[in-house]
């Protein structure tokens, strides 16, 4: 089941899944320039069964001018650039990281592909936040999200989690763990 | 909550203009792309078009082109659709949706009479 | 364009019945299709997306099944607040197109 709205945002930090749960969609979204190809699905889907999970369909991106850009391949060094400063979309294809039944890992770029994922989660999703750049990372308890279903209503848990201006960014789950960090803060309930 | 509010009904003239409105709320508006479906008695429903606020692209059905102009404006969250040259065969209601057609506004009901 | 085929146009059953809506696409179109439910003054109601996954809030009662060309909503142990206009759609490709619709009528 869809959860009714996007994670929580946090000043100064990002989101990701450590891995999808099946049902989640990813929108095929574009950098300026570029537009969805006409034929296709508008979304990739995870999906498939308890002991193996793949996401179906692919996003193709075609010059908005030109219609004949349509190919499938990882972008050069310089368009990664454009990526966000963290490279949350394909951080998580690590050799090392265990896959989850029921669940996709985060997929490869596609060409020309927009610097921002929209994905649209299912309930019981986990999202972990980090600090961005420059920013160092304040606890009073998980830095996650869980989109729960409660009274036929879903919702996302409120990260414990505050940004503040100094230098180190914070760490997701599995990467090395950041400098302990003072408890009893405020949550933040502000956007990035 | 995620909502998404239409204008009210229109009764205007042939040949005339209408532009309705869909202003979106408790979601990230420049996220998801805006849809448009028309609907009228005895008629399969029928999509009319889509507009990505974020970047302002925007596809059309080419039955609609030149008849439908779709529009948004970041800064209120609202999504626009402009009707125009109307006839008797644009009078229906018209559904604004979201966030991959799981979200749609109410209608709004335009009435082309002389 | 791509033509979706609701053969039935109405469908009458019984509370607590199980019910079948079938839906037939002119073309391939994968597993992108949707359901929405629309009730009689009311705007349409995403059910089932991608074929066969419910949207939040939607009873388990219903579900979605095929792919290709072929899709079926199945309504089972049919309850009176069923009563409406159910209808398929196919976002595979640019127009997308939706179903006649089939109207439930409870006996």
């Known amino acids: 089941e869809l959860c009714d709205d996007d994670p929580p945002k946090i000043t100064h930090a990002t989101f990701k899944a450590v891995a999808y749960k099946e049902g989640t969609m990813l929108n095929c979204e574009c950098k300026r320039g570029f537009r969805r190809i006409k034929s296709g699905s508008p979304y990739m889907l995870c999906t498939g069964n308890s002991s193996h999970s793949s996401w179906d369909n692919q996003c193709q991106c075609t010059s908005s001018a030109a219609r004949n850009t349509t190919k499938q391949v990882t972008p050069q060094p310089e368009e990664q650039k454009e990526r966000k400063t963290t490279e949350m979309q394909s951080q998580m294809q690590l050799a090392d990281q265990v896959s989850l039944p029921g669940h996709c890992r985060e997929p490869p770029p596609w060409e020309n592909e927009a610097t921002e994922r929209i994905y649209h989660f299912v309930v019981g999703q986990t999202v972990y936040y980090q600090c961005v750049q420059g920013y160092r990372a304040l606890h009073r308890g998980p830095a996650e999200s869980v989109c729960k279903m409660t009274h036929g209503k879903t919702r996302w848990t409120q990260p414990q989690l505050i940004c503040t201006g100094e230098t180190e960014p914070s760490q997701f789950p599995g990467e090395e763990e950041p400098q302990a960090s003072p408890d009893g803060l405020p949550e933040s309930e502000t956007s990035r | 909550q995620v909502q998404l509010q239409q204008s009210g009904a229109e009764l205007v003239r042939p040949g005339t203009s209408v532009k309705m409105s869909c202003k979106a709320a408790?979601?990230?508006?420049?996220?998801?792309?805006i849809g448009w479906v028309k609907q009228r008695p005895g008629h399969d429903l029928e999509w009319i078009g889509d507009?990505?606020?974020?970047?302002?692209?925007?596809n059309y059905n080419e039955k609609f082109k030149g008849k439908a102009t779709l529009t948004a404006d970041t800064s209120s969250s609202t999504a626009y659709m402009n009707l125009s040259s109307l006839t008797s065969e644009d009078s229906a209601i018209y559904y604004c949706?979201?966030?991959?057609?799981?979200?749609w506004g109410q209608g709004t009901l335009v009435t082309v009479s002389a | 364009d791509i033509l979706l085929t609701q053969s039935q146009k109405f469908m009458s059953t019984s509370v607590g019945d199980r019910v079948s809506v079938t839906c037939k696409a002119s073309?391939?179109?994968?597993?992108?299709v949707a359901w929405y439910q629309q009730k009689p003054g009311q705007s349409p109601k995403a059910l089932i997306y991608?074929?066969?996954y419910r949207y939040s809030g939607v009873p388990d009662r219903f579900t979605g099944s095929g792919s290709g060309t072929d899709f079926t909503l199945t309504i089972s142990n049919v309850q009176s607040e069923d009563l409406a206009e159910y209808f398929c759609?196919?976002?595979?490709?640019?127009?997308?197109?939706f179903g006649g619709g089939t109207k439930l009528e409870i006996k």
């Open positions: 507009i990505h606020p974020g970047g302002d692209y925007s």
């Open positions: 991608s074929a066969s």
């Open positions: 073309q391939n179109v994968g597993t992108n």
């Open positions: 408790g979601y990230t508006f420049t996220n998801y792309w």
């Open positions: 759609q196919q976002y595979n490709s640019y127009p997308y197109t």
């Open positions: 949706t979201s966030r991959n057609f799981a979200y």
